[in-house]
Interface confidence: medium
């Protein structure tokens, strides 16, 4: 069937996010992908959105992330903007109002986004074939 526009938007946003490193992409987030054997796809998307929201809520105004130069500042602002867009679109795709995030495992934001991009591309290849 036709791929959801939201899925295309998510991949587009993830591509933009993974192109550039910022001062804070090496910070850690909860790794929801480490043990997602019994998790539905919708739950995974919902939990991914929750993790991203936790990240940008904590680090949007983090002076370490904003940096000392204008370029660092704008890169961080762009990162936050894309994370917010990703959060919203993942919520749209999940269609769930809430979901628990209890994992102890951590990964860097950079690795988290790369893993999410792989999952989304796999989903896209299935729905577009």
């Amino acid at each position: 069937h036709k791929c959801d526009i939201t899925l295309q938007e998510i991949i587009k946003t993830l591509n933009s996010l993974t192109e550039q490193k910022t001062l804070c992409t090496e910070l850690t987030v909860t790794d929801i992908f480490a043990a997602s054997k019994n998790t539905t796809e919708k739950e995974t998307f919902c939990r991914a959105a929750t993790v991203l929201r936790q990240f940008y809520s904590h680090h949007e105004k983090d002076t370490r992330c904003l940096g000392a130069t204008a370029q660092q500042f704008h890169r961080h602002k762009q990162l936050i903007r894309f994370l917010k867009r990703l959060d919203r679109n993942l919520w749209g795709l999940a269609g769930l109002n809430s979901c628990p995030v209890k994992e102890a495992n951590q990964s860097t934001l950079e690795n988290f986004l790369e893993r999410l991009k792989t999952i989304m591309r796999e989903k896209y290849s299935k729905c577009s074939s």
């Epitope: 526009i5 939201t6 749209g92």
Partner: antibody, heavy 123, light 106 residues
């Protein structure tokens, strides 16, 4: 079909807080992937986005108004509200509530609007 | 913040004329742009989303194009009921409206 209706005082005194409520009928305010926003139009001027609230509960506000704005949702009443503090005459405007998003995406336009309510700031 | 510059601020045209409004973003916004119509005393109405997609139920004489920083909104054949103010709106980073273009009939 979904309808939005703004309500609240038409006159607010300077330095006070403007409070408006938008009641959603014909659908649930909790529906994903939709989001909810407030937009205003001062007399003789253009449209100005005030802020939005999303299914996750996160909010975005216009940077020029951010320090004065709070948007919240009451799912039990199927309503969302706007509070704008420390108002001045410059906040006199028609205030609209609107629904953003579309069936297959959330990052989208404001497709359904309330009819608007005029709020005058004056002593 | 992203600024949206709309031009002209007002125009007058005859029924049947082709009307073109432009909107320029202060930075690249891809195709994250919508166009709205606002009639006096009425709430704004979405006409075009994602720069070029016609909202359901909107007459085909309305169209939009552009990407990046430069966008165009066109009414191919102006009708009396098209008298309104038209706004562009970006949603690439938060939401910003253009200043509006008031369209009148000669």
């Amino acid at each position: 079909q979904l309808q939005l209706q703004e309500s609240g005082p038409g006159l607010v005194k300077p330095s006070e807080t403007l409070s408006l409520t938008c009641t959603v009928s014909g659908g649930s305010i909790s529906s994903i992937p939709y989001y909810w926003g407030w937009i205003r139009k001062p007399p003789g001027k253009g449209l100005e986005w005030i802020g939005s609230i999303y299914p996750s509960g996160s909010t975005d506000y216009n940077p020029s108004l951010k320090s004065r704005v709070t948007i919240s949702v009451d799912t039990s009443k199927n309503q969302f509200s706007l509070k704008l503090s420390s108002v001045t005459a410059a906040d006199t405007a028609v205030y609209y509530c609107a629904r953003g998003g579309a069936r297959d995406r959330i990052d989208h336009a404001f497709s359904i609007w309330g009819q608007g309510t005029m709020v005058t700031v004056s002593s | 913040d992203i600024q949206m510059t709309q031009s002209p601020s007002s125009l007058s045209a005859s029924v049947g004329d082709r009307v073109t409004i432009t909107c320029q973003a202060s930075q690249d916004i891809s195709n994250y742009l919508n166009w709205y119509q606002e009639k006096p005393g009425k709430a704004p109405k979405l006409l075009i989303y994602d720069a070029s997609n016609l909202e359901t139920g909107v007459p085909s004489r309305f169209s939009g194009s552009g990407s990046g920083t430069d966008f165009t909104f066109t009414i191919s054949s102006l009708q009396p009921e098209d008298i309104a103010t038209y706004y562009c709106q970006q949603y690439y980073d938060l939401y910003t409206f253009g200043g509006g273009t008031k369209v009148e009939i000669k």
